[in-house]
Interface confidence: low
């Protein structure tokens, strides 16, 4: 016997209660493919989520994050708080980067300053929470009487990740 449900297009469902008649999806529901026996409930973008694309009878709503948050996961399944430059997100919220680390973005984690001495260079500009150090020529490369603008940054333990 031919399955009449296969004739039901997207935006409808195959209503078994009505002899496999294709019925339109009820409000706030959708079917993105043909031949569906039920329509799916539309996603609601509430709280930290905002609507990027309204639900239609053939496609689910798409959410974004409100200002101050960014999406995580497939189809923006979560919203994660933005932090300021010089901070990273921890379980307890945004925290300033520890001394010797920086983050120049509103997301991501604090990373150690470059260790200029590893390349035989000296620190030209000190690092901050928001900016990495700037390395320059080694003291030996400078003309007599000249010295580097600042002392080298303290070395961090190799392989130490910012906590």
């Amino acid at each position: 016997l031919q399955d009449l449900c296969s004739n039901c297009p997207a935006g409808t469902f195959c209503d078994n209660n009505r002899s496999q008649i294709c019925s339109p999806c009820p409000p706030n529901s959708f079917s993105s493919a043909g031949g569906q026996r039920t329509c799916d409930i539309c996603r609601q973008c509430k709280g930290v989520f905002k609507t990027r694309k309204e639900c239609s009878s053939t496609s689910n709503a798409e959410c974004d994050c409100i200002s101050g948050y960014h999406c995580l996961g497939a189809e923006c399944s979560m919203c994660e708080q933005d932090c300021k430059q010089g901070q990273e997100l921890t379980k307890k919220g945004c925290k300033d980067c520890c001394f010797g680390t920086f983050n120049d973005q509103k997301r991501g984690i604090c990373r150690p300053w470059t260790n200029c001495s590893l390349d035989g260079k000296s620190v030209l500009v000190n690092g901050t929470k928001e900016r990495d150090v700037v390395c320059g020529p080694s003291p030996a490369d400078l003309s007599p009487g000249a010295s580097s603008a600042t002392p080298p940054a303290p070395a961090r333990e190799p392989g130490h990740s910012p906590q």
Epitope: L89, K91, Q105, I109, R111
Partner: antibody, heavy 118, light 112 residues
């Protein structure tokens, strides 16, 4: 749509330098770091370095330190990777990639084959 | 540097069957924010690598839900519930916690 388009394949002689470009479109170029990754035949993917496209500072793998320079031109939404003192070991496909959330590379360029041959 | 070690290096799978790839890191990838900084990528033949999973277990946008990531200490696993023909390629894990970012040696998934 969001994409990174790289320059075409290049053939270089040993000792020469190569520049690979990576043009971004479909997003705000200065909001995301650009990384460079290469894959030599039979080898795993290898991270070379990254540039903060906003302020332009770069960090490099020690493996390439002194040979690689990563720069960007914000007006052209383009990142560049220069590799000098090429040897046959540098024969590889070079990729640029955008760092999205949490350090992950969510968008990749199509790759640029660099051949080093005398 | 953090060393990433994958197993197996080759994985023949029958379409429709599940598959599992392991990745071990030489150091803890857990950040103080509670996330493990471990990504999974698929490098299909003739294409660029594509992001599958980030932060250990979060599926990237557009990635089918047959892909999942799990974590236990320094051991990470990528699971494919039902392998399809389009899943063929080399799978890499990568840690973006510490510079230099490092990749595993890759696992080649092929169809039986």
């Amino acid at each position: 749509q969001v994409q990174l388009v790289q320059s075409g394949a290049d053939v270089k002689k040993p000792g020469a330098s190569v520049r690979v470009s990576c043009k971004a479109s479909g997003y705000t170029f200065t909001s995301y770091p650009i990384h460079w990754v290469r894959q030599a035949p039979g080898h795993r993917l290898e991270w070379m370095g990254w540039s903060n496209a906003g302020i332009g500072n770069a960090k490099y793998s020690q493996e390439f330190q002194g040979r690689v320079t990563i720069t960007r031109d914000t007006s052209a939404s383009t990142a560049y990777m220069d590799l000098s003192s090429l040897t046959s070991e540098d024969l590889a496909v070079y990729y640029c990639a955008r760092e999205g959330v949490a350090g992950a590379f969510d968008i990749w360029g199509q790759g640029t084959m660099v051949t080093v041959s005398a | 540097d953090i060393v990433m070690t994958q197993s197996p290096l080759s994985l023949p799978v029958t379409p429709g069957e599940p598959a599992s790839i392991s990745c071990r890191s030489s150091q803890n990838l857990l950040h103080s924010n509670g996330y493990n900084y471990l990504d999974w990528y698929l490098h299909k033949p003739g294409q660029s690598p594509q992001l599958l999973i980030y932060l250990g277990s979060i599926r990237a946008s557009g990635v089918p839900d047959r892909f999942s990531g799990s974590e236990s200490g320094t051991d990470f696993t990528l699971k494919i519930s039902r392998v399809e023909a389009e899943d063929v390629g080399i799978y890499y894990c990568m840690q973006p916690l510490q510079i230099p970012y490092t990749f595993g040696q890759g696992t080649k998934l092929e169809l039986k």
